[in-house]
Amino acid sequence: EPTMYGEILSPNYPQAYPSEVEKSWDIEVPEGYGIHLYFTHLDIELSENCAYDSVQIISGDTEEGRLCGQRSSNNPHSPIVEEFQVPYNKLQVIFKSDFSNEERFTGFAAYYVATDINECTDFVDVPCSHFCNNFIGGYFCSCPPEYFLHDDMKNCGVNCSGDVFTALIGEIASPNYPKPYPENSRCEYQIRLEKGFQVVVTLRREDFDVEAADSAGNCLDSLVFVAGDRQFGPYCGHGFPGPLNIETKSNALDIIFQTDLTGQKKGWKLRYHGDPMPCPKEDTPNSVWEPAKAKYVFRDVVQITCLDGFEVVEGRVGATSFYSTCQSNGKWSNSKLKCQPVDCGIPESIENGKVEDPESTLFGSVIRYTCEEPYYYMENGGGGEYHCAGNGSWVNEVLGPELPKCVPVCGVPREPFEEKQRIIGGSDADIKNFPWQVFFDNPWAGGALINEYWVLTAAHVVEGNREPTMYVGSTSVQTSRLAKSKMLTPEHVFIHPGWKLLEVPEGRTNFDNDIALVRLKDPVKMGPTVSPICLPGTSSDYNLMDGDLGLISGWGRTEKRDRAVRLKAARLPVAPLRKCKEVKVEKPTADAEAYVFTPNMICAGGEKGMDSCKGDSGGAFAVQDPNDKTKFYAAGLVSWGPQCGTYGLYTRVKNYVDWIMKTMQENSTPRED
């Protein structure tokens, strides 16, 4: 516990002190006081440097004195033989004696008192920056006018902090500018602008004069700018050493001016203004910016439009452009969006054709559609080549995005028919010779496939059965063979409106307009044994002349049997209609004159007894196309005849082409269109 005074006596004082003693006393007076230690008696064995016995006075780490020997007062009015004055409030006194004393020594008597110290003058380091005021037990600092005492109670400074500047333009100067700035001050100024604006500081070299740096290059007085994690400065010297225009890239700037105790100069003056935050003109490949500017700033909006063939994909949705806004942080919104090549995706499949896998499905890639040759060909042209267009579609130069249509090749048998004399003047045939041949099982008859969905036959074949069962692709119509062939299911039967329906069809004498169409439920797949026959063209090239040859085929009656199991065929010439009229009807159901002959009928046969007969009805009379010798067209349909093995009558198909086309068109599905 600190005391204001005290007494210190050597051991056994005033008797002789013992040998081999070491004793210490810790003196402490209250803070703010020094210690006056004085000895009134000193009688200690003398030795060089007081090596044997001594009293030692220590202040902190410093030895203030070491005493030995005898002393007496020089002043008759004072008992003090030795004294010490220290400006600290702690002191240690240590007494030591060695193992022997040649004489009897009585030691020492000492006293200490707390004394006032003058902190203002007693120390090398001045405790106050400006005015120091001593009082008993302490001191206090004070400041000149317009200065204030800092929290450390020692330093004075000017009140130059706390200013916040929010205006978009302004001027800031050091205190008293252009008079010398205050020493020992730290001035902090804050500029706080609206987000999206950066603080730009402008200085003139001549507006800056701050105490220069020391020999090590450290500023003694300094001006520093702090913008977020960026710092500009410290700056000092005569004339501003930094850039005269400082773009801070921040809406918040702290200006710190720090001065020391010496060397005041005129200081500094600066201007600042708020610039809208710039956003960099970024390099966005495969796109254009609108509007195009040299510099973009806060709140600027640009439309970034992808070049043709590129798109921006966001959330799996493609767009050709997007908007980007220069944000308050100097960054563009939507900066993650990029223009990438358009992906047209997997090409669509087409019926009866294929598309080879492309190497890529991206913009500019090329694909090629082909039809299943030789049974299908590309109807709508365009060559089948498509490229991935900028809009994400596979596009053909002729058809645009419309896909190619593979339609059956008509009138081309896989194997040509070769006559081998056998049946009613006819020969055995293979279905590959007549791939259009359709078999009707009830009534036993024929028909001709004209495309994927339609069968052409005679009206009298279907008038009594509107849901006929049909087969294609088989030479033999044995039940076991038919099971393996392709069965066709009818959706609807269309009989020509000019065909007269009778109560008793057996007594028919008028076979005019003996033509019908059967619409199929499902499309027929073409191949070597199933393929359509062509329809006649409407030009005069397709007008038949007497003697023109045609092929007939079917499973009708032969000389030997009522029905053929294997397909038969014959080549016969066109004959004048009168030849048919002249033949006597074999089993007339009416007067010979009652039988009707019209221009809608073709007469053919009469050569070597070759003819169609019962069971061949509806089959095609196939004639070589005058404009393409590789193809056959259905010039006629087996209709009726006066007598098998003579001449037969065939429906003249050319006269019905318009009705056929119209019927098919009106009753097609979108797949066919």
Epitope: G345, P347, S349, P670
Partner: antibody, heavy 118, light 109 residues
Framework: EVMLVESGGGLVKPGGSLRLSCAAS????????MSWVRQAPGKGLEWVAT????????YELDSVDGRFTISRDNSKDTLYLQMNSLRAEDTALYYC???????????WGQGTLVTVSS | QIVLTQSPATLSLSPGERATLSCTAS???????LHWYQQKPGKAPKLWIY???NLASGVPSRFSGSGSGTDYTLTISSLQPEDFATYYC??????????FGQGTKLEIK
């Protein structure tokens, strides 16, 4: 007649693998893009993956990407779905389907059931 | 991704009545790539209408489809007993994924 027959389904533990197959017949398999579609019990249809006719280009649902792989062997007229790291939420009836015009799925198999359970 | 929302979730009607099933897309869909499927319990789905309005093979003419943009409709003019099933709409978009609606169950009242 177009036919698609799936196989390879069954019960598997979470984290396990399965390979589904789809045997095609009645059409030119190599001419058509194909897809897998699944249906969780009592739920709706969910597309899983698509492959181009030649097999060079594939697309998978994000949630199965990296775990499921669609492939095909045109010489065998067969479509496959390799399923790894299976999860309980992959439990479903898996259908294969043929892609027709405008990517409509015009023929579907009868499905194969995949059950992922511990 | 494009989300297809079908409404109503369940539609209870009697044979002979007219049925209208709706499919709404979260963003525009090309009408060429909007399709409908019919599914009966325990069976695989069947393509029913393709490219918005084209009836698939074997689909009766009492069915029709219409729509454009984001709104599509499947209509049955006069319900027959065999029409009661679940119908799904489906869209294809080149950037994938292909999505289906959650389905509308058409049940006998």
């Amino acid at each position: 007649e177009v036919m698609l027959v799936e196989s390879g389904g069954g019960l598997v533990k979470p984290g396990g693998s399965l390979r589904l197959s789809c045997a095609a017949s009645g059409f030119e398999f190599e001419n058509y893009a194909m897809s897998w579609v699944r249906q969780a019990p009592g739920k709706g249809l969910e597309w899983v993956a698509t492959i181009s006719s030649g097999g060079s280009h594939t697309y998978e649902l994000d949630s199965v990407d990296g775990r499921f792989t669609i492939s095909r062997d045109n010489s065998k007229d067969t479509l496959y779905l390799q399923m790894n790291s299976l999860r309980a939420e992959d439990t479903a009836l898996y259908y294969c389907a043929r892609l027709f015009t405008k990517h409509a799925m015009d023929y579907w198999g009868q499905g194969t059931l995949v059950t992922v359970s511990s | 991704q494009i989300v297809l929302t079908q409404s109503p979730a369940t539609l209870s009607l009697s044979p002979g009545e007219r049925a209208t099933l709706s499919c709404t897309a979260s963003s525009e869909v090309s009408s060429s790539y909007l399709h409908w499927y019919q599914q009966k319990p325990g069976k695989a789905p069947k393509l029913w209408i393709y490219s918005t309005s084209n009836l698939a093979s074997g689909v009766p003419s009492r069915f029709s489809g219409s729509g454009s943009g984001t709104d599509y409709t499947l209509t049955i003019s006069s319900l027959q007993p065999e029409d009661f099933a679940t119908y799904y709409c489906h869209q294809y978009y080149r950037l994938h994924p292909i999505t289906f609606g959650q389905g509308t169950k058409l049940e006998i009242k």
